[in-house]
């Protein structure tokens, strides 16, 4: 049906056949998230009606199928500037039972009224400033927060579970007050971090190795990333101890989010969520992930359980395969990985033993090959600064900060550039922080050391003299046609 | 039976391993000598590197030497303080006590007046008193944004010990002194069993003997270029851009025959100036093939590949491209900060409509 | 990326031991289910043995009793020891690697022949 028809039906108000039209179009544009251009009058028409409607009430009986018009309506940003007013956001919230002025609705709420509301509400703060300023303004977040909270005492449906966290995700990450408000006032941390736990259904101590649901995996990511929004500007200060707590708390819960796999394909998204959070926590948190008890079947090394640091490894090999999006998919699992190498020493010689074992293909450069080490190696070439920075400072530390290590393991052509960011091109600091670290030579390496070129660090011949056979005067010569290209570039 | 030796058997065995040992160490020692050559334009960011290399000498400076810097101590310190003075103008920074101007004036006054290698108690009070203003220290946090000696804050931070009649340069002093280099720098450092020599060639021409043991057996060429340099507009005794010379050159020392075999590595320096130049300035200025998009990432490559593909011995020689900018940081979180939008972002990009 | 290589295939009399073994290579990787299969031919794979990460086995009936499945997480390989064999083991065995975020792999296969 098309939008006028619709709107012509609204105007001459018989209910049941404006009822009819709208269930029309909405099975007609259920799958529509691109309009024409040639009706967008028509449609605007037909928003401010449906507005003029929302904000004097709709009647109960048909209250879902004008919210789902509205919500097809929210998807065209040409409709945006009807549906975001004072007004319409107020009334959306209301039947959403989130508004902050009402008293709670007495009777248990229609969920699929209260779902098309969230769905409406999700679709405004997505694509539009001006209800993203409102729903700010509107504290929707305080009573979403309470709502969040009451989840271990009441039932409510897997969707408006997932609605309710993805429109605290939109909130957070387009509004910092909102992030500020849900951080502090609203002990946000807390709160999360108590429906995650519900959401895995795991108590902190038990690790089981579990496959997460579906559902359950769509709503922890929306957790993830709503913690992730909140903490991220926040965890940079110091941690009381009371934080600390709560931060390490979290943390288990990660872990085992790292340990678990998700239902469908969704593992690595899962992950990538839960590893951006981890990036998050407090330094000095981070040791729980070095926690894990040890059982039958877990990787142990010196004493410590790696499966998460595996897992972490893993994880990292799997994202570095891919070419876009670089950055944001690499930075922060090696942020996490470097932390725990510098801070934990069996952590370091795990990961060195992984990703740095002892030097035995000795003729090919450190950066070709497609072992672990070759990838991060070519990483720290790489054009985006901070994606070489991170690589090379993983490297650099897994070397025990010692830049001769650096250097053995990476070639100085390869290390040049973090030297050269940290002041270290000439050595600074002969040894790194972590004396007690040893680093064993293969017989391969021993054999070939005197060959290999420090700079490409690989064995290589060395090469006939350029320059063999000339007398005196032709090197002089060629040495000044040299000098004089050198003038001029430092002119 | 047959199998057990003597012990003068034994004994020589030792020997000729012992031998073979040395002979190998000697060969090592050799081998793991790696010289860099230095090469880069007045303002590509060379400097930079060249800070932080961390000059070891062998047995230091004597006293007599660390003496004669007194004079290079001085001058570095008021030229600091005159460059920083001018900048406050340049970058319309006022002094936080207007008493301040007078003293600025008289600064210049005294300065010009100024002994060699004497330093007045009255000038010395002048440069202090200037120091310690708060609008000078708000110009001094800018300097990069105009030319400053890097060891000004050291030696202003120092006047007191420095102003005393019997003032003696320390090895630390004459280490932070800057003089217009001219001709080669040679500058030794050591990792462990690697023994450095790099040599930072100025273009002055000195003697030329010194110039052939430069060239000789060269490990790495280190080539500094500022990105940011791309569209700077030609002076008028100039045939062509500051890029495209600093490409004709690299062309010519990447296909030197004295560095057929030389790595080099390539420092694309000033890379922030370059992000925020890329946005207004497109990069058909300097390259008027160019068909990409004017976003850092593709137009940094771009410049790479120019670079990059000047070379014509890709199979043996390598290049070792870093772009880097000053602002670089030590840590890890800084750079876990710089992502935290872009996740943001992407996990917007990623939510779809309902 | 993900390579499995088996290897303890052999002729064997019956009521001998075999010890098969598969082991991955090609990165860092976390193996969810390891399993063992086997074909004859005209016939469709069938199940032998499977573990979890976690340890937990699960066998076919025909070897209850017989072969023990096991692994090493640290070198990512599985074992099938078989004990007491029998003509009709006689079969290609394939394992079979669930790997997180890669999905399934399969060996090449190693031929078993009990005789008698």
């Known amino acids: 049906m098309e939008p006028r028809a619709v709107a012509d039906a609204l105007e001459t108000g018989e209910e049941d056949a404006v009822t009819e039209a709208l269930r029309s179009f909405n099975r007609e544009h259920s799958q529509s998230f691109t309009f024409d251009d040639a009706q967008q009058e028509d449609r605007k028409r037909l928003a401010k009606l449906l507005v003029s409607v929302l904000e004097q009430g709709l009647s109960p009986k048909h209250r879902v199928t004008w919210l789902q018009t509205i919500r097809i309506l929210s998807r065209d940003r040409s409709c945006l500037d009807s549906f975001a007013s004072r007004q319409s956001l107020h009334a959306l919230a209301c039947y959403a039972d989130i508004a902050i002025s009402e008293e709670p609705i007495p009777q248990p709420p229609d969920m699929d009224v209260l779902l098309e509301s969230l769905k409406c509400l999700c679709n405004l703060v997505l694509s539009s400033p001006t209800a993203q300023m409102l729903a700010a303004e509107a504290r929707l977040v305080v009573r979403l927060a309470e709502r969040v909270g009451l989840y271990r005492k009441r039932s409510y449906p897997h969707e408006v579970q997932f609605f309710d966290l993805r429109l605290l995700f939109l909130l957070t990450a387009l509004r910092t007050d909102v992030r500020q408000q849900l951080f502090q006032e609203l002990h946000g941390v807390r709160l999360l971090t108590d429906a995650l736990e519900l959401t895995l259904g795991v108590a902190p101590k038990e690790n089981p190795l579990v496959i997460l649901p579906a559902q359950e995996t769509e709503r922890a990511m929306e957790i993830l990333k709503v913690l992730f929004n909140i903490t991220y500007d926040s965890v940079k200060r110091e941690v009381d101890e009371e934080d600390a707590a709560l931060y390490r708390y979290l943390g288990t819960l990660l872990r085992h989010c790292v340990m678990a796999d998700a239902a469908g394909d969704r593992t690595e998204e899962f992950h990538g969520h839960t590893v951006n959070l981890l990036g998050n926590l407090p330094l000095k948190c981070l040791d729980v992930l070095l926690a894990l008890e040890l059982h039958e079947g877990s990787l142990e090394f010196m004493g410590v359980n790696m499966d998460v640091i595996n897992a972490l490894l893993a994880f990292l090999e799997k994202r570095l395969h891919q070419t876009h999006r670089l950055k944001e998919c690499v930075a922060p699992v090696l942020s996490v990985l470097t932390e725990c190498a510098r801070m934990h020493r069996p952590a370091r010689k795990f990961l060195k033993a992984q990703v740095l074992p002892p030097l035995r293909d000795v003729r090919t450069r450190p950066e070709v090959g497609d072992l672990l080490r070759n990838k991060l190696v070519r990483l720290m070439t790489h054009l985006d600064t901070d994606v070489k920075r991170v690589a090379a400072e993983f490297l650099f530390v897994l070397c025990s900060e010692s830049v001769p290590r650096f250097i053995k393991y990476t070639g100085y052509g390869n290390a040049a550039g973090l030297l050269a960011a940290r002041g270290l091109m000439a050595g600074g600091r002969p040894e790194g922080q972590y004396s007690e670290d040893e680093d064993t030579d293969t017989e391969e390496y021993r054999e070939a050391k005197a060959s290999i070129n420090p700079v490409t660090g690989r064995v290589e011949e060395k090469p006939p003299n350029p320059m063999e056979g000339m007398t005196e005067e032709q090197k002089e010569h060629e040495a000044m046609k040299l000098v004089n290209m050198f003038d001029k570039l430092s002119r | 039976m047959g199998c057990t030796l003597s012990a003068e058997d034994k004994a020589a065995v030792e020997r000729s391993k012992m031998i073979d040992r040395n002979l190998r160490e000697d060969g090592e020692k050799a081998a793991r000598e790696v010289k860099l050559l230095l090469l880069g334009a007045g303002e590509s960011g060379k400097s930079t590197i060249v800070k932080q290399m961390k000059i070891i000498h062998e047995a230091g400076y004597s006293e007599e030497e660390c003496k004669q810097y007194k004079a290079v101590v001085y001058s570095n310190t008021i030229q600091s303080i005159i460059a920083i003075i001018r900048a406050m103008g340049r970058l319309k920074i006022d002094f936080g006590d207007a008493a301040r101007a007078d003293d600025a004036r008289q600064l210049f006054v005294l300065a010009g007046a100024a002994e060699e290698g004497f330093m007045t108690a009255e000038l010395a009070g002048v440069i202090k008193r200037l120091w310690k203003d708060s609008g000078v220290q708000a110009c001094f946090n800018r300097s990069r944004e105009y030319q400053l000696n890097d060891s000004a804050a050291y030696y202003l931070n120092d006047l007191d010990r420095i102003a005393q009649p019997n003032y003696i340069p320390t090895q630390q002093d004459v280490l932070r002194t800057r003089v217009k280099t001219t001709g080669i720098v040679e500058t030794h450092f050591t990792f462990k069993d690697l023994h450095f020599k790099m040599f930072d060639v100025g273009g002055q021409r000195s003697e030329r003997k010194k110039w052939i043991h430069c060239f000789e057996g060269v490990t790495a060429i280190i080539f500094c270029v500022a990105l940011s340099d791309y569209d700077l507009v030609l002076a008028e005794d100039e045939e062509m851009n500051r890029m495209h010379e600093s490409m004709k050159l690299f062309d010519s020392i990447c296909n030197n025959k004295w560095f057929t075999d030389t790595s080099i590595i390539l420092f694309l320096n000033k890379k922030d100036l370059f992000e925020e130049k890329i946005k207004k300035s497109p990069l058909t200025i300097c390259y008027p093939e160019y068909a990409g998009s004017n976003t850092y990432e593709e137009a940094a490559a771009y410049i790479q590949c120019q670079f990059e593909d000047l070379n014509k011995r890709k199979d043996t020689k390598e290049i070792y491209t870093h772009f880097t900018c000053a602002t670089d940081t030590k840590n890890v979180q800084f750079v876990f900060d710089a992502v935290t939008d872009v996740i943001i972002k992407n996990n917007l990009k990623d939510c779809g409509l309902f | 990326q993900v390579q499995l290589v088996e290897s303890g295939g052999d002729l064997v009399q019956a009521g001998g031991s075999l010890r098969l073994s598969c082991a991955a290579s090609g990165g860092i990787f976390i193996i969810n289910n390891m399993g063992w299969y086997r074909q004859t031919p005209g016939n469709q794979r069938e199940l032998v043995a499977e573990i979890t990460r976690a340890g937990n086995s699960n066998y076919a009936d025909s070897v209850k009793g017989r072969f023990t499945i096991s692994r090493d997480n640290a070198k990512n390989t599985v074992y099938l020891q078989m004990n007491r064999l029998k003509p009709e083991d006689t079969a290609v065995y394939y394992c079979?690697?669930?790997?997180?975020?890669?999905?399934?792999?399969w060996g090449q296969g190693t031929q078993v022949t009990v005789s008698s």
């Open positions: 079979n690697f669930n790997v997180r975020y890669y999905g399934e792999y």
